[in-house]
Interface confidence: medium
């Protein structure tokens, strides 16, 4: 999960750019991402008790179907086949009223924040936070970006406590600590 | 059990090379970026390099740049510090860092004496 | 660059007693768009290597006992030690990682135990 060059002092960051329809901007990496994707458990630190919860889904594991699934019966396959399209469909089209309705809410609100320290126009966002922004909408300023941190599939080695994270339904597991992505 | 453990050090002449290392291991290595920290005898702490996880980042401070290398074998969960024409001023302690969010973890140090 | 000041360079305090180390940055840390401070606090005892001991200026590390306290915002900051123990014997140093490269720290203050 790779995202562009960006100067590394943080500064002239472009503003988020839009995202495709299966993927949701998230303030926290800055970055698009698969609406479903989760980050990695944090190792525990020495002396730490029972390793961090996991969720159902990690990021190096296959999202489509598994070995057990591959040999579905030809009425599975013509049946199933359309289902998922039509899913997919639906969730693009929700995904599309998402991403609209937000826009109209920030230009409601007249999003943009004007202060600015020594920074990028990227900001990290609190660790709840993995939203869906329109594109063109920038922070005036921020820390360096990324805050310090690693790959969005990654929290850092200790304690991992998952919460919903997402205002599309999937859960990520987070930390206390996380402050966000890789520098890039 | 998070670890970091650094060797290397030792004593080299000025202008000498030295490669130090920190092998990883309790912790995804290959998820995560590094920074190796120095200790000059009776001084403070001095951030010396950067390497993001997958090495496509790197940087240096402006006292070693040109001279230190930072690099990783992520398969290998090893961290290196390639130091070439040491300086006295490079004599220190070097520290290698789990990079999250600040230095999370640090490990127990080499020890490099640059002198003739 | 940032450049990160701590005062006093060393102090000396009896077991039991309240101590309070300042550190304070070249511009600020403080980040409006998510009100956190970008300062680390770290403390490193002698012949050992650095320990993190808050984060986000005031959140303590698992593990760090409740003596410790961060707080400040913006450019001043300040380490509070409730109530010394001998094994608080140490140096400690802060750090900011508001823009970077270079993670800078402080110079760091002693704490002596009388």
């Known amino acids: 999960m790779r995202r562009g060059p960006r100067s590394l002092r943080g500064r002239d960051a472009p503003a988020p750019t839009p995202c495709v329809p299966a993927e949701c901007f998230d303030l926290l990496v800055r970055h698009c991402v698969a609406c479903g994707l989760l980050r990695t458990p944090r190792p525990k630190p020495a002396g730490a008790s029972s390793p961090a919860p996991r969720t159902a889904l990690q990021p190096q594991e296959s999202v489509g179907a598994g070995a057990g699934e591959a040999a579905l019966p030809l009425p599975g396959l013509l049946f199933g086949a359309p289902a998922l399209l039509g899913l997919a469909l639906v969730l693009a089209l929700v995904l599309v009223g998402l991403v609209s309705w937000r826009r109209r809410q920030r230009r409601l609100r007249g999003a943009s924040s004007a202060e600015a320290p020594d920074g990028d126009k990227d900001a990290p966002e609190p660790l709840d936070k993995v939203i869906i922004l329109s594109p063109g909408i920038s922070d005036a300023t921020a820390p360096a970006w990324p805050p310090p941190g690693e790959d969005p599939g990654t929290t850092p080695p200790g304690h991992s406590v998952p919460v919903p994270a997402t205002e599309l339904g999937s859960t990520e597991l987070v930390t206390t600590k996380t402050a966000g992505p890789e520098q890039q | 059990d998070v670890q970091l453990v650094e060797s290397g050090g030792g004593l080299v002449q000025p202008g000498g090379s030295r490669k130090l290392s920190c092998a990883a291991s309790?912790?995804?290595?290959?998820?995560?970026?590094m920074h190796w920290v120095r200790q000059a005898p009776e001084k403070g702490l001095e951030w010396v390099a950067y390497?993001?996880?997958?090495?496509?980042?790197?940087n240096y401070a402006d006292t070693v740049k040109g001279r230190f290398t930072i690099s990783r074998d992520n398969p290998k969960n090893t961290l290196f510090l390639q130091m070439t024409s040491l300086r006295s001023e490079d004599t220190a302690m070097y520290y290698c860092?789990?990079?999250?969010?600040?230095?999370?973890?640090w490990g127990q140090g080499t020890s490099v004496t640059v002198s003739s | 660059d940032i450049v990160m000041s701590q005062s006093p360079s060393s102090l000396t305090v009896s077991v039991g007693e309240k101590v309070s180390m300042s550190c304070k940055s070249s511009?600020?840390?403080?980040?409006?768009?998510?009100?956190?401070?970008?300062l680390a606090w770290y403390q490193q005892k002698p012949g050992q290597s650095p320990k993190l001991l808050i984060y986000?200026?005031?959140t303590r590390e698992s593990g760090v006992p409740d003596r410790f306290a961060g707080s400040g915002s913006g450019t001043d900051f300040t380490l509070t030690i409730s109530s010394v123990k001998a094994e608080d014997l140490a140096v400690y140093y802060c750090?900011?990682?508001?823009?970077?490269?270079?993670?800078?720290f402080g110079g760091g203050t002693k704490l002596e135990i009388k």
């Open positions: 750090q900011q990682y508001y823009i970077y490269p270079p993670w800078t």
């Open positions: 860092t789990i990079y999250y969010y600040a230095m999370d973890y």
């Open positions: 511009q600020t840390l403080l980040y409006s768009g998510n009100q956190k401070n970008y």
């Open positions: 986000w200026a005031s």
């Open positions: 390497i993001n996880s997958g090495s496509s980042t790197i």
């Open positions: 309790g912790f995804t290595f290959s998820s995560f970026g």
